[in-house]
């Protein structure tokens, strides 16, 4: 029978008695930076080319006995998971292996850097099709390693890495913390985070998605026909490298940003039990398990968006947090979140010729997060329209006044520490969906975009009684671009997008003791692109 992990990543329409997705990733080359491998294992023989690259530290301990099958164990298994003929994800992908980990699975930053440079030079000397680089390793945070990953990613290479097996915040490790890298956590057959002894998969905002990573059957270096079960975020990353190879083989022109958005879009949503993660990491950790798209030709017509969380601002009074989109993505909205509820909102601002999302901490606050909604919107022209605090009691409002521009997101930011605590909420007049409304003490920022065929609509969900969480989702065919709370409720901790749902969080009502300002309204801006839909119909 088909191994559980291959079944898990396969959409139902492919599920027969065997795992045979349409294209095996044959146009893609996957580089594996790991241990040495047993290239004559029948699972990978002829599929993996062992390069002459080797840069590893000496093994620890004077009594270490170098045994070939042990030296090759990790790398052989991962090569099998990516492209093995029997238990591999991308059965058509060809691989090249570089040895950067020794027989004890240890490597150095310098060895990995030189390995990445070797790949870059190989790419320049002999350009081939799409390249995927699998980095199934994790070490302490390294600015220089992250920078090297960024350079390679900007040269058009897709990098996939393990989140790490330390049951810790992946942002503390490299290359997992590099924003340009696709960082993968591990889940088991029950879609739960993988526990490894006393540790387990890493988590947090630096993880892009999870993938099968427990009891993964793959080639064993023990013998030419041997198979073994291994676990960890390396195995999970290998699945995503295989899925990426399949996607790139079907659509070789995909950019890194497009690939990442598709990986997120086609993932299984909200299946992971978040209770496994530390409480402060649950909101930051994506509840996504990787899967193959249901057809080889991706949804080019779809408006793809993802949520990017910033690092925590820290508790100082003027602290800010910044969330950024990838170079090829558009920032369509910006929101903020604070566990204490003490924040001064957020704003979209230009930085280095690109919009970023900045959130502001408030006096006595424990710190804030900025949350960017980053979307793929070809030929987009976006700008931010700002209205300063209003004099009138009706509150501040701003709309998209340029012809053909539509509202994709609303932000509000205020200077005063305690914004309108005892004022009733401002009600937006009906029939004016193309505008943002806020407190009169706040400046309001509207994200306004023009793109061919782009249309957006506002959707609200209000609850009169106090609730810890209010949500509103965009319907099928529409994509959430903006998420905010209607002003007036001081107990709102913030708003953020989870997949296609806008979530507004409020302070635990039992602690506020407030009833007069109980109403909470979540406001979603849902968009779609008719232009992209038409373009895809013409292509078929």
């Amino acid at each position: 029978s088909i191994p559980w992990n291959l079944e898990r990543i396969t959409p139902p329409r492919y599920r027969a008695d065997e795992y045979q997705p349409p294209d095996g990733g044959s146009l893609v080359e996957v580089y594996l930076l790991d241990t040495s491998i047993q290239s004559d294992h029948r699972e990978i023989e002829g599929r993996v080319m062992v390069t002459d690259f080797e840069n590893v530290p000496e093994e620890d301990g004077t009594r270490f006995h170098r045994q070939a099958s042990k030296c090759d164990s990790h790398g052989t298994h991962l090569a099998g998971v990516v492209s093995g003929r029997d238990a591999g994800v991308a059965k058509g992908a060809s691989m090249r292996s570089l040895r950067v980990l020794n027989c004890q699975g240890k490597g150095t930053v310098s060895g990995t850097l030189i390995g990445l440079e070797f790949i870059r030079k190989s790419q320049l000397v002999q350009p081939v099709g799409p390249l995927v680089v699998l980095l199934p390793l994790a070490g302490g945070y390294s600015r220089v390693l992250n920078a090297a990953c960024q350079r390679l990613a900007r040269a058009g290479v897709v990098l996939v890495t393990a989140a790490g097996n330390f049951r810790d915040d992946a942002c503390l490790y490299s290359p997992a913390s590099a924003p340009e890298v696709i960082t993968v956590g591990a889940t088991n057959a029950q879609d739960q985070p993988v526990t490894l002894g006393t540790l387990g998969t890493n988590f947090g905002r630096c993880v892009d998605l999870f993938a099968p990573g427990e009891d993964i059957i793959g080639a064993s270096s023990d013998c030419s026909t041997c198979f073994v079960s291994q676990s960890g975020t390396s195995q999970a990353a290998a699945h995503v490298a295989g899925i990426a190879a399949m996607m790139l083989s079907a659509e070789p022109e995909l950019t890194l940003a497009e690939l990442r958005q598709r990986l997120i879009h086609f993932s299984a949503k909200d299946v992971i039990n978040e209770a496994w993660f530390p409480e402060d990491q649950r909101v930051l950790t994506p509840n996504l398990v990787a899967a193959l798209p249901p057809s080889t030709h991706g949804a080019g017509w779809q408006l793809f968006c993802r949520t990017v969380w910033s690092a925590h601002s820290g508790p100082t009074r003027m602290a800010t947090a910044v969330a950024r989109c990838a170079p090829d993505e558009e920032l369509l909205s910006c929101s903020s979140f604070s566990r204490s509820g003490k924040r001064r909102g957020e704003r979209m601002e230009a930085q280095g010729g690109k919009l970023v999302c900045r959130a502001h901490n408030a006096f006595g606050g424990e710190g804030v997060y900025a949350i960017a909604r980053c979307c793929l919107l070809p030929q987009a022209n976006c700008s931010v329209h700002t209205a300063p605090p209003a004099e009138a009691s009706m509150g501040t409002r701003v709309h998209c006044h340029q012809q053909g521009h539509v509202l994709t997101g609303c932000s509000s930011h205020w200077e005063v520490e305690d914004l309108g605590t005892h004022k009733p909420p401002v009600l937006r007049p009906r029939g004016q969906p193309n505008q943002c409304v806020g407190h009169r003490e706040a400046s309001i920022h509207a994200s306004c975009c023009h793109a061919p065929g782009l249309e957006c609509k506002v959707k609200e969900h209000g609850i009169p009684a106090p609730q810890e969480q209010v949500t509103v989702a965009c319907e099928e065919g529409w994509t959430l671009t903006g998420c905010s709370a209607l002003p007036g409720t001081s107990h709102v901790l913030g708003a953020y997008a989870v997949d296609n749902t806008c979530v507004v969080r409020s302070r635990d009502v039992s602690t506020t003791g407030s009833t007069s300002e109980g109403a909470v309204t979540a406001v979603a801006i849902c968009c779609r692109s008719r232009h992209l839909a038409q373009a895809s119909q013409e292509l078929q």
């Epitope: 065997e18 029948r42 023989e45 029997d86 064993s220 026909t225």
Partner: antibody, heavy 119, light 113 residues
């Protein structure tokens, strides 16, 4: 049911070419390896090589490398063993057998093809 | 190459008696990663293809009578027919399937005494 059906007996002259076949049915042909095994008259079993029909990957025993060619046509679930120039010493019974990554032993065998090479 | 050596070459046993065939590999076929012995036993009757009896050194293939059993580990293995029946007259082969080339023992012919 699962079976491997081989082509019929052949009588050939030295120097002639030959291609014998093994057709799989009752299972997913591309998920299993097909091996060829030789048994010379009154002798034991010798593994010649194998093919993975999914991607036509082959692996030969050193003793048979260059002497025979193993191929497959997955569209008709058939594996082949061929000689470009037969020798009298190729006279033998040839069996095909299948195996799987999770069961890498030969659980199903063809009925055998007897090849006789004689001038 | 892993060399498989069977003993004896032939064996004559009375009906209902125990038949024991030994097989030795030139190197271990037991692998630590999954703790399995990559060894199988086959039965070949005259004019027929071989038939799988035992795999992983001791697991009986479905449909094989329970009088057939396999034992051993590492390099030394045994096939036992606990009570020989007339239909068990055949040549028996051991095979290692861990390394290429896949190799068979030379065979042991079992007859009725």
């Amino acid at each position: 049911q699962v079976q491997l059906v081989q082509s019929g007996a052949e009588v050939k002259k030295p120097g002639e070419s030959l291609k014998i076949s093994c057709k799989g049915s009752g299972y997913s042909f591309t998920d299993y390896y097909i091996s060829w095994v030789r048994q010379m008259p009154g002798k034991g079993l010798e593994w010649m090589g194998m093919i993975y029909p999914g991607d036509s990957y082959t692996h030969y025993s050193q003793n048979f490398q260059g002497q025979v060619t193993i191929s497959a046509d997955k569209s008709i679930s058939t594996a082949y063993l061929q000689w470009s120039s037969l020798k009298a010493s190729d006279t033998a019974m040839y069996y095909c057998a299948r195996d799987h990554w999770s069961r890498p032993f030969f659980d199903v065998w063809g009925q055998g093809t007897l090849v006789t090479v004689s001038s | 190459d892993i060399v498989m050596t069977q003993s004896p070459d032939s064996l004559a046993v009375s009906l209902g008696e125990r038949a024991t065939i030994n097989c030795r590999s030139s190197q271990s076929v037991l692998y630590s990663s999954n703790n399995k012995n990559y060894l199988a036993w086959y039965q070949q009757k005259p004019g027929q293809p071989p038939k799988l009896l035992i795999y992983w050194a001791s697991t009986r293939e479905s449909g094989v009578p329970d009088r057939f059993s396999g034992s051993g580990s590492g390099t030394d293995f045994t096939l036992t027919i606990s009570s020989l029946q007339a239909e068990d007259v055949a040549v028996y082969y051991c095979q290692q399937y861990s390394s290429f080339p896949i190799t068979f023992g030379q065979g042991t012919k079992v007859e009725i005494k």
